[in-house]
Amino acid sequence: GSMGHAPKVGRLIYTAGGYFRQSLSYLEAYNPSDGTWLDLADLQVPRSGLAGCVVGGLLYAVGGRNNSPDGNTDSSALDCYNPMTNQWSPCAPMSVPRNRIGVGVIDGHIYAVGGSHGCIHHNSVERYEPERDEWHLVAPMLTRRIGVGVAVLNRLLYAVGGFDGTNRLNSAECYYPERNEWRMITAMNTIRSGAGVCVLHNCIYAAGGYDGQDQLNSVERYDVETETWTFVAPMKHRRSALGITVHQGRIYVLGGYDGHTFLDSVECYDPDTDTWSEVTRMTSGRSGVGVAVTME
């Protein structure tokens, strides 16, 4: 990526890292308003299986691994990107490396959920306080999960699907910060590991993933009021290890792996019409990206 100053624009969809033949250091941003891509400052270390989030207008890249011809190293790193300066800076590392991690943000704190270190599949969860640059462990999940989808709704943290080291999962659980405890919620209709999970209009969406046999294009959403999962329109492409985010009331899914090809496809879901459309392509196909949207 270029090292010049990033243009001062509104809400962008950032995609960091990923995998194609090896872990990638790209940081690119898509502007849905004009369909353009920006090439931004590279990650300091290539990584895939990371997660992205935004706190206080800063983009954070969390965990993952550097899978390169020289070796394979799981990451405990937390790195912070400032869109105003187009620069990355390291923050305090997590207590353990977490590849194929999930993250969520509650009250300005980043929760790092699950992931793997070698063949250890974590159920542990830790919380980062940006103002102190500190991580602290919180209650562990009831289930070990890598490739876990994480979303926050009504100040509750949801961990959805994943892989426990033996089985891909359709189970999901919810963390209550005030009680520091996890509780199981209704399981999905479909086993999904490496799904894209996000929140839109008071529902949790789980898109794609891998069921232990095949990549999926199906999408389902969880209504917290009725505690039920319901299918919505499927994506055009089967994909696992995809990136996902919400921008102006629409869901965007980025890249992933379809069992044969690393996808460059970006699809957008409109909940009003229950339809998916191809909106753009990434500059190259990749899986295992970290995705987040800048705040207004």
């Epitope: 394979n72 070698g118 080291g165 899986s287 295992g288």
Partner: antibody
Framework: EVQLVESGGGLVQPGGSLRLSCAAS????????IHWVRQAPGKGLEWVAS????????LYAKSVAGRFTISADTSKNTAYLQMNSLRAEDTAVYYC????????????WGQGTLVTVSS | DIQMTQSPSSLSASVGDRVTITCRAS??????VAWYQQKPGKAPKLLIY???SLYSGVPSRFSGSRSGTDFTLTISSLQPEDFATYYC?????????FGQGTKVEIK
């Protein structure tokens, strides 16, 4: 019955290339991480490469990184090992194996295919 | 890389004997160790995974155990078809590595 069948081995000159295939029947290669393991004549087992069915990520032993490429075609239920810039020390029987659990061993193995690198 | 040091490299035993083979990991590998049996000209066969779990279809005379970084394969009563070479493998850390093998021969 679960079966993996390798093919594509043979005699090749140093610097040459070969592509090994591993055709699965009785199970889907997409349901397992696929590994290639080799065994030089009279020697022990050496892990070579693997591909993750969920992310597409590949891993390689240092001895083959940059020269070998593992891939899978789920529509053909077949995995491949493309071997370039072959060296005499790559001479071995090459096995493909399916590993179903992170902490497990490889429960399904092919019969092996011999690759001989010699001038 | 993690080294898996297997001992002995060979042993002679009789049918009915109790046989023990050990693998020592150069660093912690948790329980991510498998054991294989290989006969000449054949592919390896999985016996034990996760250090002590018996793979489907494997006779119960085979067992595995772990003590720290030491892993043991035990054959409680050696049968004629058990004469073969045995390998341990760690899958805890990249790259996966094998022990050098133990050849079990007829006394």
């Amino acid at each position: 019955e679960v079966q993996l069948v390798e093919s594509g081995g043979g005699l090749v000159q140093p610097g040459g290339s070969l592509r090994l295939s591993c055709a699965a029947s009785g199970f889907a290669i997409s349901a397992s991480s696929i590994h290639w393991v080799r065994q030089a004549p009279g020697k022990g087992l050496e892990w070579v490469a693997s591909i993750d069915p969920e992310t597409g990520e590949t891993l390689y032993a240092k001895s083959v990184a940059g020269r070998f490429t593992i891939s899978a075609d789920t529509s053909k239920n077949t995995a491949y090992l493309q071997m370039n810039s072959l060296r005499a020390e790559d001479t071995a029987v090459y096995y493909c194996a399916g590993l179903l659990w992170s902490w497990g061993g490889a429960g399904s193995w092919g019969q092996g295919t011999l690759v001989t690198v010699s001038s | 890389d993690i080294q898996m040091t297997q001992s002995p490299s060979s042993l002679s035993a009789s049918v009915g004997d109790r046989v023990t083979i050990t693998c020592r990991a150069s660093q912690s590998v948790s329980s991510a160790v498998a054991w294989y049996q290989q006969k000449p000209g054949k592919a390896p066969k999985l016996l034990i995974y996760s250090a002590s779990s018996l793979y489907s279809g494997v006779p119960s005379r085979f067992s595995g155990s772990r003590s720290g970084t030491d892993f043991t394969l035990t054959i409680s009563s050696l049968q004629p078809e058990d004469f073969a070479t045995y390998y341990c493998q760690q899958s805890y850390s990249f790259p996966s590595t094998f022990g050098q093998g133990t050849k079990v021969e007829i006394k």
